[in-house]
């Protein structure tokens, strides 16, 4: 056979020869020859390779450091890395989730639009007219002002984005 200049998918060119790549979960021990196939070995415990490859060393599984607020979301295999997520009340600081920060709380006058997850922070929104929030919270939405009319009461003090309306009895002296 003529020496190739390009190789098929899942092959690599070395010494004018097309050799098979090692499958995911295995590392390269020795290149193929005209007489032998590529020699591959499975990755060890706590190691992985997630692509067809010619790597001579497997990658170490990611360590989910509890000191950084991390825990294992999905255990790694010989073909996949470990996936870390954050402990309850915390979220990742980056897509790689290398460390965690405490979920942000929404200040009074703001309510939770979207509750935080292990990978995203709390999203707050200002309470619109007719709604309020009087606490700093990572869970509370803006609450609607109390409807005094439905209680047969009148507004004694107008509500704000931080306070509810204050209802009171109707003035019976008024004609």
């Amino acid at each position: 056979p003529e020496p190739p200049t390009a190789c098929r998918e899942k092959q690599y060119l070395i010494n004018s020869q097309c050799c098979s790549l090692c499958q995911p979960g295995q590392k390269l021990v020795s290149d193929c020859t005209e007489f032998t196939e590529t020699e591959c070995l499975p990755c060890g415990e706590s190691e992985f390779l997630d692509t067809w490859n010619r790597e001579t060393h497997c990658h170490q599984h990611k360590y989910c450091d509890p000191n950084l607020g991390l825990r294992v979301q999905q255990k790694g295999t010989s073909e996949t890395d470990t996936i870390c997520t954050c402990e309850e009340g915390w979220h990742c600081t980056s897509e790689a989730c290398e460390s965690c920060v405490l979920h942000r709380s929404c200040s009074p006058g703001f309510g939770v639009k979207q509750i935080a997850t292990g990978v995203s922070d709390t999203i707050c929104e200002p309470c619109p007219v007719g709604f309020f929030s009087n606490v700093s919270s990572a869970f509370e939405k803006c609450h609607p002002w109390t409807s005094c009319e439905t209680k047969d009461l009148v507004v004694q003090q107008a509500g704000t984005n931080k306070t509810d309306v204050v209802c009171g009895p109707q003035d019976r002296l008024r004609a």
Epitope: P1, E2, P3, V29, S30, C32, T33, E34, F35, T36, E37, E39
Partner: antibody, heavy 117, light 107 residues
Framework: EVQLVESGGGLVKPGGSLRLSCAAS????????ISWVRQAPGKGLEWVSS????????YYPDNVKGRFTISRDNAKNSLYLQMNSLRAEDTAVYYC??????????WGQGTLVTVSS | EIVLTQSPATLSLSPGERATLSCRAS??????LHWYQQKPGQAPRLLIK???QSISGIPARFSGSGSGTDFTLTISSLEPEDFAVYFC?????????FGGGTKVEIK
């Protein structure tokens, strides 16, 4: 037609030397790796040596390493096996075989080497 | 070294019968295995490559299967010229090794 013809076999005393040749024809010799395989009388097949198409890489099992040397002359379409320090257990029919897609796809008819005092 | 164990050592069958020959590797070799046929006084001949790939000029009654450590050569219906010795060979790693052979003889 692919042809491989071995020669150089014969009777040799223990400790002696012998040089086997393999003449190739019918294909582009310089494009193929070639191996030597032997077969002791009434026994199975045993790989002895291999050489890459360019002659730059050679391979041996431990039991012949240091005693046998494989070489080739692509200009002459010829393969060689220099065997030194021969032992009684080297007695066998020696075949040369072409490596096509990592298989021994064509074989010679073999040459008999007898090591005896 | 990868050791190939062939079984049975001898298979006694009649023409027209089906022959099933086994080759077991001491460690996984994917599909890196070839089969050869050898008749008395002749050189071996390549029958099957890469465990199951057919060879041009070899009758269709010869087929191979298996991957990893267990391999099978099947002769669907024995012809008189099929009575011979069959060898498997691995090319997964050095040294290249052959099985001890299975002799298919006439019953």
């Amino acid at each position: 037609e692919v042809q491989l013809v071995e020669s150089g076999g014969g009777l040799v005393k223990p400790g002696g030397s012998l040089r086997l040749s393999c003449a190739a024809s019918g294909f582009t010799f310089s494009n193929y790796g070639i191996s030597w395989v032997r077969q002791a009388p009434g026994k199975g097949l045993e790989w002895v040596s291999s050489i890459s198409s360019g002659g730059d890489n050679t391979y041996y099992p431990d039991n012949v390493k240091g005693r046998f040397t494989i070489s080739r002359d692509n200009a002459k379409n010829s393969l060689y096996l220099q065997m030194n320090s021969l032992r009684a257990e080297d007695t066998a029919v020696y075949y040369c075989a072409r490596a096509g897609e990592k298989a021994m796809d064509y074989w010679g008819q073999g040459t008999l080497v007898t090591v005896s005092s | 070294e990868i050791v190939l164990t062939q079984s049975p050592a001898t298979l006694s069958l009649s023409p027209g019968e089906r022959a099933t020959l086994s080759c077991r590797a001491s460690q996984t070799i994917n599909n890196n295995l070839h089969w050869y046929q050898q008749k008395p006084g002749q050189a071996p001949r390549l029958l099957i490559k890469y465990a199951s790939q057919s060879i041009s000029g070899i009758p269709a009654r010869f087929s191979g299967s298996g991957s990893g450590t267990d391999f099978t050569l099947t002769i669907s219906s024995l012809e008189p010229e099929d009575f011979a010795v069959y060898f498997c060979q691995q090319f997964s790693s050095w040294p290249l090794t052959f099985g001890g052979g299975t002799k298919v003889e006439i019953k």
